[in-house]
């Protein structure tokens, strides 16, 4: 594991990374839940969508999210890999024309209606973590991850590799 400077050096590359294709390399419809098996749900309220983290009743249907995966090239000077280095980026859409967005000023995760090409705020670097969980790092704010705070999704700053394993930024993807 490496310390604060290591995380920052790695994630600094996200600012300059470029999506290598306008089409996703694959798409996947899945339910999203927390490390502790709470479901991420989406509700239409007053013509806007709210995002909740909650325990579902038995046999209650889980909301699905369309995950679209894109390849993103590391800038060669950052990764030390020349043109070799790639990252896997993802956008998350729970319903047509709406995508999860990182609001870095408010440290919040919001659903925004928008057209393609999507803004950078809709892209997250996918990290495979332990226990077959994943984490989502903001493209626009390296070192900041989607996490759970007070039964809502929020943006959480991670400043050391040890904190990358904290449960509140770990999510599970499931087809069921």
């Amino acid at each position: 594991a490496f310390g604060i400077s290591g995380v920052q050096k790695y994630t600094r590359a996200l600012h300059d990374s470029s999506i290598t294709g306008i089409s996703p390399i694959t798409e996947y419809l899945a339910s999203l839940s927390t490390y502790n098996d709470q479901s991420i749900t989406f509700a239409l309220e007053d013509e806007s969508y709210e995002i909740y983290v909650e325990d579902l009743k038995k046999d209650e249907k889980k909301d699905k999210v369309l995950l679209s995966y894109y390849e993103s090239q590391h800038p060669s000077n950052e990764s030390g890999d020349g043109v070799d280095g790639k990252m896997l980026m993802v956008t998350l859409s729970p319903t047509k024309d709406f995508w999860l967005h990182a609001n870095n000023k408010e440290h919040s995760v919001e659903l925004h209606k928008c057209e393609k090409p999507l803004p950078d705020q809709a892209f997250f670097v996918l990290h495979n973590m332990h226990s077959n969980c994943v984490s989502f790092e903001c493209k626009t704010d390296p070192g900041v991850f989607i996490g759970v705070k007070d039964n809502h999704l929020a943006l959480i700053k991670v400043d050391s590799s040890e904190n990358l394993c904290t449960e509140n930024i770990l999510f599970k993807l499931s087809e069921t």
Partner: antibody, heavy 122, light 107 residues
Framework: EVQLVESGGGLVQPGGSLRLSCAAS????????MTWVRQVPGKGLEGVSA????????YYTDSVKGRFTISRDNSKNTLFLQMNSLRAEDTAVYFC???????????????WGQGTLVTVSS | DIQMTQSPSSVSVSVGDRVTITCRAS??????LAWYQQKPGKAPKLLIY???SLQSGVPSRFSGSGSGTDFTLTISSLQPEDFATYYC?????????FGGGTKVEIK
């Protein structure tokens, strides 16, 4: 150019230990998922262990849990596999490999070393 | 653990033939599948990743398809250098498991 060079293989008695090394060049080791894969001569491939780039989290296949330890030295850009309590069934060529994607194993393994042979026999 | 079943285990073909190798996962793995080529005494070489993405430098006669549980590697017109063993690997979840391999031999 990305290069992975394994070393440390050899003949060891059952119950003995070996430490395999994988020297990486052309990229930053700590930015990528790395894995050890083994192959019994003439047989198929088996994933043994892996380590996450950014978090350092480790993974093991059931047959080596508690006996093998994967680690890395970031300053030397080198990956290790410490193998203890070795058994005859651990005899294989051991490869280290690097993922396509820096933060994810979803893309599989793009770069491989040449392999190092471990023989466990009395 | 996810089991990967590859078929056939071996196939005898001629140069110029079309070759199809299939791989079946014991549970859904979305598109998280890779295909490798291995020649005797050498390390595996990545051909296809994310089920259908062609690795840079790999000839276009290689292609991959499928999602969920059923996947296919196709070599459209076999060349002399393609005689080798081919492996699929699920990259969906740990432990990342390989198929048993398909040996492509000269008829």
């Amino acid at each position: 150019e990305v290069q992975l060079v394994e070393s440390g293989g050899g003949l060891v008695q059952p119950g003995g230990s070996l430490r395999l090394s994988c020297a990486a060049s052309g990229f930053t080791l700590r930015s990528y998922f790395m894995t050890w894969v083994r192959q019994v001569p003439g047989k198929g491939l088996e994933g043994v262990s892996a380590i996450s780039g950014i978090s350092g989290g480790t993974y093991y296949t059931d047959s080596v849990k508690g006996r093998f330890t994967i680690s890395r030295d970031n300053s030397k850009n080198t990956l290790f596999l410490q193998m203890n309590s070795l058994r005859a069934e651990d005899t294989a060529v051991y490869f280290c490999a690097r993922t396509v994607y820096s933060s994810s194993y979803y893309g599989g393994f793009q770069h491989w070393g040449q392999g190092t042979l471990v023989t466990v026999s009395s | 653990d996810i089991q990967m079943t590859q078929s056939p285990s071996s196939v005898s073909v001629s140069v110029g033939d079309r070759v199809t190798i299939t791989c079946r996962a014991s549970q859904g793995i979305s598109s998280w599948l890779a295909w490798y080529q291995q020649k005797p005494g050498k390390a595996p070489k990545l051909l296809i990743y994310v089920a259908s993405s062609l690795q840079s430098g790999v000839p276009s006669r290689f292609s991959g398809s499928g999602s969920g549980t059923d996947f296919t590697l196709t070599i459209s017109s076999l060349q002399p250098e393609d005689f080798a063993t081919y492996y699929c690997q699920q990259t969906n979840s740990f432990p990342l498991t390989f198929g048993g391999g398909t040996k492509v031999e000269i008829k």
